[in-house]
Interface confidence: medium
């Protein structure tokens, strides 16, 4: 979690002198409670916006907007603490609006916005706005919270942001997977315009189950420049496993901008349709494919006789 660096943060508006400060997320009013505290924010809204840094990079940001209730407690409102919590890491970042002048009622409702918290693709956040000073220990809460889910890099607007482009969002491999026969699976995909290697992970599952009964990793060396944007195909040798029939193929690129953390693309081949009178399936789960000459052991990572070609 971080703040967008593009310019000085402002919270002043006509009728209010205000400054934005970094916050430890532990306002002084927690430690030294006040007798009179303002009411909670009203109509907290969080939206996905996009903003450029000074360097011209485009980032997704949380656009936070709220209004004040029209009660006399605004006379005691000294500011607000904005907190963003990333739910999967428990990382929290806060800023504080410090009002340098007293708020007065005016003909329209006071409205505040802040759009400088940079958020990550495919992450969920809890956004909280606390009015300051915070309430006494048993006082009514004067904050409002909302959860905010950031779309992943498949989202049209997200796809062109710097974090998504860095993780390879512009690459569309257009994967096709075809069962050639009971022992062979053919994977076709489009190479990107970078001389980097790829990894194909084949994971097979029994019909209707999520425990893998087969896993195999295949390495594809870096293509030459003349092969960029061309179709590449790989033929993977399977074993005719009874019941181990649903195959998921995942392609992981290793682009220089994202290394081990590039976006992975996958495609799935479903189990064939059951005939009207199916053969009885034994209650055991066979595992692996026959050894081929190039393979050291038959196991989860170096099943032999997979090979690949690049098409022009």
């Amino acid at each position: 979690l971080r703040l967008l660096d593009h310019r000085a943060l402002v919270c002043s508006q006509p009728g209010l002198n205000c400054t934005v400060k970094n916050s430890t997320c532990l306002d002084d009013s927690w430690i030294h409670p006040r007798n009179l505290t303002p009411s909670s924010p009203k109509d907290l809204q969080i939206q996905l916006h996009f903003a450029h840094t000074q360097q011209g990079d485009l980032f997704p940001v949380a656009h936070i907007e709220w209004t004040l209730q029209t009660d006399a407690s605004i006379l005691y409102l000294e500011g607000a603490e904005l907190s963003v919590l990333q739910l999967n890491t428990n990382e929290r970042l806060c800023v504080r609006f410090e009002f340098l002048s007293k708020l007065r009622h005016h003909h329209r409702r006071w409205r505040f916005t802040f759009s400088h918290f940079v958020v990550d693709p495919d992450q969920e956040y809890e956004v909280t706005v606390h009015h300051l000073p915070k309430p006494i220990p048993d006082g009514d809460p004067n904050h409002q919270s909302k959860n905010f889910l950031v779309p992943d890099c498949e989202h049209a607007r997200m796809k062109v942001t710097t974090p998504c482009m860095s993780s390879g969002s512009l690459w569309d491999p257009n994967i096709t997977v075809e069962t050639l026969d009971t022992q062979h699976l053919r994977v076709d995909f489009t190479l990107w315009n970078e001389s980097t290697h790829y990894q194909i992970l084949l994971t097979s599952f029994p019909h209707m189950e999520n425990h893998s009964c087969f896993e195999h990793m295949h390495h594809i060396p870096a293509p030459r420049p003349e092969e960029f944007h061309q179709r590449s195909n790989v033929t993977l040798t399977l074993r005719n496993l009874k019941g181990c029939c649903r195959h998921q193929v995942q392609i992981q690129p290793f682009f220089s901008s994202c290394l081990n953390d590039c976006l992975r693309h996958s495609a799935t081949v479903s189990c064939p349709e059951m005939p009207d009178t199916p053969e009885p399936i034994p209650d055991y789960m066979p595992l692996w494919e026959p050894r081929s000459g190039s393979s050291d052991y038959k196991d989860d990572d170096d099943k032999g006789s997979s090979h690949h070609h690049h098409h022009h």
């Epitope: 992970l201 994971t203 425990h211 893998s212 009964c213 896993e215 990793m217 995942q250 055991y284 789960m285 066979p286 595992l287 692996w288 050894r291 052991y297 038959k298 196991d299 989860d300 990572d301 170096d302």
Partner: antibody, heavy 116, light 107 residues
């Protein structure tokens, strides 16, 4: 050369949990799965389960389902096996081994003693 | 699950003699069978995989044969360092299962 180095011996009370680590070196950790096998004193070998170091997929022995959790930390090339609700018959040497099916390298073993 | 049965439980052999160890599966495991050697206080050591292929660094006196349900590990001429417990293991079906072991001792 390939090495799997396991954490030290543990003594636990019934009902407690134990977490055994297995640090791999000498090869690319995410290319090979890690399996766990245990051996009770004077007894044979018992397969406990397997974890894919690449995808995180797991497959556990039916009798341990619900009590065992296998995890990996690819940043340190370490696999972990946690066993909960320990009973006296869980007293055994616990081995990690490389690969999913046929085990070509083994850790030195970790003795876990469960005793009140 | 597939039950692996090893026989005999103990085999007494003199150094230099031939030792033949048997492993039987309760149903076919094709050639998906491995043999391991274990000495007291040590981890198992891989000897054979795919029923008949020697693992890296394993002496030629160790050989494996069989497919389906019946498998054999043969040590052509026992050396002093070969006295140990030997386990077979099938990896054709989940759960993976081991035989109970054969102890090869000095006669």
């Amino acid at each position: 050369q390939v090495q799997l180095v396991q954490s030290g011996a543990e003594v636990k009370k019934p009902g407690a949990s134990v977490k055994v680590s297995c640090k791999a070196s000498g090869y690319t950790f995410t290319r090979y799965g890690i399996s766990w096998v245990r051996q009770a004193p004077g007894q044979g070998l018992e397969w406990m389960g397997w974890i894919s170091t690449y995808s995180g997929n797991t497959n556990y022995a039916q009798k341990l389902q619900g009590r065992v959790t296998m995890t990996t930390d690819t940043s340190t090339s370490t696999a972990y096996m946690e066993l909960r609700s320990l009973r006296s018959d869980d007293t055994a040497v616990y081995y990690c081994a490389r690969r999913q099916l046929y085990f070509d390298y083994w850790g030195q073993g970790t003795l876990v003693t469960v005793s009140s | 699950e597939i039950v692996m049965t090893q026989s005999p439980a103990t085999l007494s052999v003199s150094p230099g003699e031939r030792a033949t160890l048997s492993c039987r599966a309760s149903q076919s495991v094709s050639s998906n069978l491995a043999w391991f050697q274990q000495k007291p206080g040590q981890a198992p050591r891989p000897l054979i995989y795919d029923a008949s292929t020697r693992a890296t660094g394993v002496p030629a006196r160790f050989s494996g044969s069989g497919s389906g349900t019946d498998f054999t590990l043969t040590i052509s001429s026992l050396q002093s360092e070969d006295f140990a417990v030997y386990y077979c293991q099938q990896y054709d079906n989940w759960p993976l299962t081991f035989g109970g072991g054969t102890k090869v001792e000095i006669k």
